[in-house]
Each structure stands twice: as structure tokens, then as C-alpha cells.
């Protein structure tokens, strides 16, 4: 039979999230026993404040802090906990919107969730004995803290606050779903999953950095494409005091401070798109694996999930050829992105090229991990734009596009493809901010010359733009493959920072479809109005905010 | 530095076809978007359509069935054609560039050519 | 069609004078209006993009805000060259549209 319902135990009451939510985890000295109180305290362990924007621009803000006076497993731990407790009703929503019968009682796949479980379990396992056997490292003192910060908010959730101090046990089908959402695209093809959520084609984010004339400035931007049903969206920030390792006398680490867009219980980004205290900006866009033949390379020994890569590397990594260096270690190619890491310490405002630094691309995919310095690319032709499609040759043919453009076409080319020419065709028009945001969201299918697909009915396709809007395709059309049907998905956020900004730890940031030039998206009126979207505004006509942290 | 030049026809009568040629300079017209713009003697000011980079167009749709805009590259010309005038055509006529759909504005005009319909 | 209303029809000011246009959509339109300025004679000239952000070339004096529904162009000082008529423009969907415009005098 099914597997038993995962996640959210407890049923949530009351689904109107506060407007503004403040807590603190306390440490009981004389019991050893946390607990959460509301407010900031001076000698709480974590604080985290929750303000719930929702409805006026479609992004919830959270402010989250640890105590350096207390050693970095507490801390991750009771990170984890109160991030949970200020955004419970959040959580729930977003659960529900978009994992709750993943794998649940409605579940007619059984052989392929037993299959994920006992992989999750088996990497679950295996990365605790690596703990174990590695405690000094930094590497494995960061995969820990991370695991820790997850155990940490499905207990809080849960009503349950109990700090491990040994091994511990990460729920393989619970709130860690919510994490591995990107890997799942993987592992469910690896695993053999008959209905994947990944449709052929399906674009999966745009992203572009942009060296302004005179390099005055530099801008990174990035446009998330996902399920509407994962619009409830919060912008993190957070502070927290990790060591090198977990001896009081390692350093704290670089990457101790950031901002990033996410998700309700989710501890990283998964767009991905961060602005660290380390100087750097990293962001992805993905790339997949279209060849069969490599998914032998994804293992649950020897590797360690993507999303779990990410934060590592963001947290130890000084520059970029470190941050690659972080990552590629027990490549699990699950997840499998281009990842641009700019390092706005090598750039020089109104100067020449540094030469090197400034831009690192990296690509994954599996049994195969390829990084490159590409600042002078950069400094060449002014951009470089990112669209789902590996710039490298090797990684190209490899992941098995070649086949692709040769079955459909120039879409799945690397030079071709719609986006491909759009961004080399307009990237030439960004002067600032305000520009850079109107090209990140750019969707004019209807009038776009190179938004026409040929080989469909209608021509016009919403998918070819930077910022998807399949929900605009007509559901009775005919097109060659999925990514260009009607579906409710599409770039569903956009996010701008430049070299100033970037040093406040700061962005400017719009939620939901773009409406620039196309009607806005509204759930009432839209074919998909019965999916669930619990939390969600129904009409989304955000204009971008700057991000107020005080 | 772009520039737009009008030419045509002062006077049309009644039920002919208006034809209008837009001159560009300074920039091509293989980029951008290349509008036609009226204003009547009441000062409101209409889009009547455009021909893209790639040649393909668009039309107001209150127009549809009466304009078609052309174009020549080797000339760095464009042109519009409007069929069946009648007295309600009467305008100032400018051709209008938008550079593209990140710039959603126009940005360079020609200085206007007014034409008169009647018999 | 997104309709554009321009009011007032006619302005009438003093040299040195702040004076403000308004322009409305019949639905939200985010920041995607301009305005121009049309002098006698002359043909349309671009002001005021995207509502707030100036044009090189232009005057400082001249200002756009508003979002949504609801947009103003300013001028702060009003020169006796910026006697025209001012049109705002919409960029949301096409047809693009234009308000019925604004004159502005000098009392």
C-alpha cells in the first residue's frame, strides 16, 4: 500500500499568518531545555522576526539571528526552531500547495516512493557515519549544521523540542521535501518514476550579470520559473555566528550572513539566488540530464544532496574558486544547474578588468563537474546570461542535448534558443536598475519575433521569453513538446542587486508572473483556479520592492 | 543621432489609398520597431501599428482591415498604407521608433505630415 | 483597449509656478506610462518614462510618480518654452493608447 501521510503533523487552526510574528529560543541553564518566548531576548539562542507582506507585494520577510555565545550545533538547531514558529501557518500552506500527496495516501507510484525512501535513507545514513568519522572537518561540521537547522524546524513544527546530541534522524519523506525539491526532478528520473514533474524542455529560471558602460556597475539578476503553486514566498536573512569547525578556537566562517529568496521551511534558496557577507552573489539556473546513461552516477553512498552542496559552499567559500572547489566534493548529480558565483570584492568599480574572480561559472551534472573563470568573457562582451542550457561543450554533449537539437531544433541549442537571442539582442539596453528589471521580466510573446515557435499552433509561445508565462498558451493548441503547453508555470519572481546593493545586503525584488506587457495573473480567472494555493493574493500585480531589512 | 522624415500626400479623396513613406537615418531599421502614429484635429493621438526587425507587424486592431505597413531595408525605408479613407482619416501622420520591448516608449518621432481627406 | 483620461483639458499657470498633470488608466497598468511633451509645430518628445525615471536632455524640473491607476507629471517651475500639450502614454498592452492630453497656458 501507500506510504503513510509525511510532513506537517499537526493541523493548523487558525491560517491567517500574523502580520509581524517575534521569537525567541531561550536556553533553560538548569534543565538544559530549550524553549520559545516571544520577543527578542538579549540571551536567547536564536531570534527570528517574521513580517508577513504577503498580500501587499507578495513577499513575507524573515529576519533570523543565532548567539554566538552558544556552540554552532545549538544554534543550527534553534535556527531551525524558531524559523518554524514565526512562519507555522506559512509552512503549512506551502506544503499543502505543493508537496502534501507527494508520496502520500494517494499515491498510485508505490514501487518508486519506496524506492526514493530507501535512497534518502541509505544518504541519510551514510552522511551521519561521514559526520562521524570526519568530526573535524569543516566540511562535514557544515553538512551537520545543516542537518541540524533541518531537524531543528521539524521538531519545532511539530511541538516537539528536543536538541540532539548524538546521531539524529532526518524524516527521509517529511519537511527534508521541501529541501530536495530541485533534486527530486533528478532522482525521480533516476529512479525510474513513470509521471515526472519535470516536462521536456521546462525551463527552469533566467539569469543575467550585466557589466554596465565603463564598468560603473555590475547587476545580477534572476528569474525563478516554477509552479504558480509555489508563490508563497518569503525573503530571508541570516545572521548567524558558525565556526570553521566545531572547536571554539576555528574561526567563524565567511558566509555567516545572507540574503536570499525562498520558500516557507525551506533553509536555503532552491531558485537559487543568495547575496552573502563573504562578498559574493551566487545564483543558478538549471541545466538537467538528458542522457539516460548517466543517472548510474547518482548514488546515495558517496554523495551529498545539491541542496546541501549549496549552503555548504555558501557558508565556507571566500571567492569563487573555492566556492566550486566546496561544491564539486560528493557530486550527487541530482539537481544538476549552471551556477554563477560573481565576487563583487574583485570588481572594480569604474576600472579595467581584474582579469580573474569576478566570475566563476560552474556546471553540473551527473559524474561530471566543470568550473571555469569567465571574467574576461564578461568584460568582453558586457553579460553573461544563463537560460537552462550548458555553456560548456563537454557538459553540453554529455548531458545529452546534442540528440535534442537534433530531434527539435535550435530551441535546445545554446546559441539559438529563444532566450538565448533575446537577452544577446537586448542585454545591450540595461543602463540601470529599472531596466535590468524590465529585461529579467521581459514577456512580450505576442509581439516578439523570437517568441514564435514554429512547429506550434499557435505560433506565439509564452514560454519563449525570460520570464515564462505558459498559463497565457492556448490549452488547444499544438506544440511538439511540453514545455511549450498551457501549464501553471512560468517565471515567478525577479530579483536585481548591484555592487552597492550588494554590500547592504540588499536587492530589489518583484513577486509573482510578469505583467509588464501581458495581463496579470489571477487564480479566479485563471484555468487552474482549483489547484490549491492556499496563503496566495489571487491577483498578482506586484511592482518590485526594495528589501527592508532595518 | 536617429531621424525619422515624413512623406506623402497632403490631400486624399475619399476611398482612396493613403500611402505614406517613413525615411530613417542614423539607425537601421533591421532593429527596433517601426510605428505609424496620428493625430486628429481633436489633439488625440492613435498607434496605428508597427513592422518589427524581422519584418513581421501589427496592426490597431480598429484599423485591421484597412492598413498594411511595408518596409524596405535597402532604402532604410518603411511605409504605411491605408485603404478606403474617409474624412475621419483626416490627421497629422508620424512615423515613431521603439527601440524595443525593454524600451516600450518612442523614443525618436518625424516631425509629421498632415494630411486632409476630402473631395 | 486601456483607456487613458487626462485631466485637466486646459492648465493655465504663471511663469515660476508648480503645476501638476493627471493621468489615469482604466485598469493597472504597474509603472508602464510615459508622457511627452508636444509644442506647437513640433512633433511629440519623450519627458517622463516608465512614470518616475528622467530622460537625458530633459529639464530636472520635470518629474513623473504614481502607479497602478493613478499617475502625475510635475513641473516645478514652470518656463514660458514649456507652454505645449502633455499626453501620457500606456505600455501595458497593446494597442498602446494616449491620454486626451493636457494644455497648458500661460494666465
Known amino acids: 500500500g501507500a506510504l503513510p501521510t509525511q510532513g506537517p503533523g499537526r493541523r493548523r487552526q487558525n491560517l491567517d499568518p500574523p502580520v509581524s510574528r517575534v521569537r525567541s529560543v531561550l536556553l533553560d541553564a538548569a534543565s538544559g531545555q530549550l524553549r520559545l518566548v516571544d520577543g527578542i531576548h538579549p540571551y536567547a539562542v536564536a531570534w527570528a522576526n517574521l513580517t508577513n507582506a504577503i498580500r501587499e507585494t507578495g513577499w513575507a520577510y524573515l529576519d533570523l539571528g543565532t548567539n554566538g555565545s552558544y556552540n554552532d550545533s545549538l544554534q543550527a538547531y534553534a535556527a531551525g526552531v524558531v524559523e518554524a514558529s514565526v512562519s507555522e501557518e506559512l509552512i503549512y500552506m506551502h506544503w499543502m500547495n505543493t508537496m502534501v500527496n507527494y508520496c502520500g495516501p494517494f499515491e498510485y507510484e508505490v514501487g518508486y516512493c519506496e524506492k526514493l525512501k530507501s535512497f534518502l535513507e541509505i544518504n541519510l545514513e551514510w552522511m551521519q557515519r561521514e559526520m562521524e568519522l570526519s568530526q573535524d572537518s569543516p566540511y562535514w561540521h557544515q553538512v551537520r549544521l545543516t542537518l541540524l537547522q533541518l531537524k531543528g524546524l521539524e521538531d519545532s513544527y511539530e511541538g516537539r523540542l528536543t536538541f540532539p546530541t548524538g546521531r539524529f534522524t532526518i524524516k527521509p519523506l517529511g519537511f527534508l521535501l521541501l529541501q530536495i525539491a530541485g533534486d527530486l526532478e533528478d532522482l525521480e528520473q533516476a529512479l525510474n518514476k513513470t509521471s515526472t514533474k519535470l516536462s521536456l524542455g521546462s525551463g527552469s529560471c533566467s539569469a543575467i550579470i550585466k557589466l554596465l558602460p565603463g564598468a560603473r556597475d555590475l547587476l545580477v539578476a534572476h528569474n525563478t520559473w516554477n509552479s504558480y503553486q509555489n508563490m508563497l514566498r518569503i525573503i530571508k536573512k541570516y545572521q548567524l555566528q558558525f565556526r570553521q569547525g566545531p572547536q571554539e578556537a576555528y574561526p567563524l566562517i565567511a558566509g555567516n550572513n545572507l540574503v536570499f529568496s525562498s520558500y516557507p521551511g525551506t533553509i536555503f534558496s532552491g531558485d537559487d539566488f543568495y547575496i552573502l557577507g563573504s562578498g559574493l552573489v551566487t545564483l543558478e539556473t538549471t541545466i538537467g540530464n538528458k542522457n539516460p546513461a548517466l543517472w548510474k552516477y547518482v548514488q546515495p553512498q558517496g554523495c551529498v544532496l545539491e541542496w546541501i552542496r549549496n549552503i555548504v559552499a555558501n557558508r565556507l567559500a571566500l571567492d569563487g574558486a573555492t566556492w566550486a572547489d566546496i561544491f564539486k566534493q560528493f557530486n550527487s548529480g541530482t539537481y544538476n544547474n549552471q551556477w554563477m558565483i560573481v565576487d563583487y570584492k574583485a570588481f572594480i568599480p569604474n576600472g579595467p578588468s581584474p582579469g580573474s574572480r569576478v566570475l566563476t561559472i560552474l556546471e553540473q551534472i551527473p559524474g561530471m563537474v566543470v568550473v571555469a573563470d569567465k571574467t574576461e568573457d564578461l568584460y568582453k562582451t558586457t553579460y553573461w546570461a544563463s537560460y537552462n542550457i550548458p555553456f560548456f561543450e563537454i557538459v553540453f554533449n554529455a548531458s545529452g542535448l546534442q540528440d535534442l537539437v537534433a530531434q527539435y531544433g535550435d530551441w535546445f541549442s545554446y546559441t539559438k534558443n529563444p532566450r538565448a537571442q533575446i537577452f544577446q539582442r537586448d542585454q545591450s539596453l540595461v543602463e540601470d536598475m529599472n531596466s535590468m528589471v524590465r529585461l529579467i521580466r521581459y514577456n512580450n510573446f505576442l509581439h516578439d519575433p523570437l517568441s514564435l515557435c514554429e512547429a506550434c499552433i499557435p505560433k506565439p509561445n509564452a514560454e519563449n521569453a525570460i520570464s515564462a508565462r505558459s498559463d497565457l498558451n492556448p490549452a488547444n493548441g499544438s506544440y511538439p513538446f511540453q514545455a511549450l503547453y498551457q501549464r501553471p508555470h512560468g517565471g515567478i519572481d525577479v530579483k536585481v542587486t548591484s555592487f552597492s546593493l550588494a554590500k547592504r545586503m540588499s536587492m530589489l525584488a518583484a513577486s509573482g508572473p510578469t505583467w509588464d506587457q501581458l495581463p496579470p495573473f489571477q487564480w479566479s480567472l485563471s484555468p487552474f483556479r482549483s489547484m490549491l494555493h492556499m496563503g496566495q493574493p489571487d491577483l498578482w500585480t506586484f511592482s518590485p520592492i526594495s528589501v527592508p531589512w532595518d | 543621432e536617429v531621424q525619422l522624415q515624413e512623406s506623402g500626400p497632403c490631400l486624399v479623396k475619399p476611398s482612396q489609398t493613403l500611402s505614406l513613406t517613413c525615411s530613417v537615418t542614423g539607425d537601421s531599421i533591421t532593429s527596433g520597431y517601426w510605428n505609424w502614429i496620428r493625430k486628429f484635429p481633436g489633439n488625440k493621438l492613435e498607434s496605428m501599428g508597427y513592422i518589427s526587425y524581422s519584418g513581421s507587424t501589427y496592426y490597431n486592431p480598429s484599423l485591421k482591415s484597412r492598413i498594411s505597413i511595408t518596409r524596405d531595408t535597402s532604402k532604410n525605408q518603411y511605409y504605411l498604407q491605408l485603404n478606403s479613407v474617409t474624412t475621419e482619416d483626416t490627421a497629422t501622420y508620424y512615423c515613431?521608433?521603439?527601440?524595443?520591448?525593454?524600451?516600450?516608449?518612442?523614443?525618436?518621432w518625424g516631425q509629421g505630415t498632415t494630411l486632409t481627406v476630402s473631395s | 483597449d486601456i483607456v487613458m483620461t487626462q485631466s485637466p483639458a486646459i492648465l493655465s499657470v504663471s511663469p515660476g509656478e508648480r503645476v501638476s498633470f493627471s493621468c489615469r488608466a482604466s485598469q493597472s497598468i504597474g509603472t508602464s506610462i510615459h508622457w511627452y511633451q508636444q509644442r506647437r509645430n513640433g512633433s511629440p518628445r519623450l519627458l517622463i518614462k516608465y512614470a518616475s525615471e528622467s530622460i537625458s536632455g530633459i529639464p530636472s524640473r520635470f518629474s513623473g510618480s504614481g502607479s497602478g491607476t493613478d499617475f502625475i507629471l510635475s513641473i516645478n517651475s514652470v518656463e514660458s518654452e514649456d507652454i505645449a500639450d502633455y499626453y501620457c502614454?500606456?505600455?501595458?498592452?497593446?494597442?498602446?493608447?494616449f491620454g486626451g492630453g493636457t494644455k497648458l497656458e500661460l494666465k
Open positions: 515613431a521608433r521603439i527601440a524595443s520591448w525593454i524600451t516600450t516608449y518612442f523614443d525618436y
Open positions: 502614454q500606456q505600455s501595458n498592452s497593446w494597442p498602446y493608447t
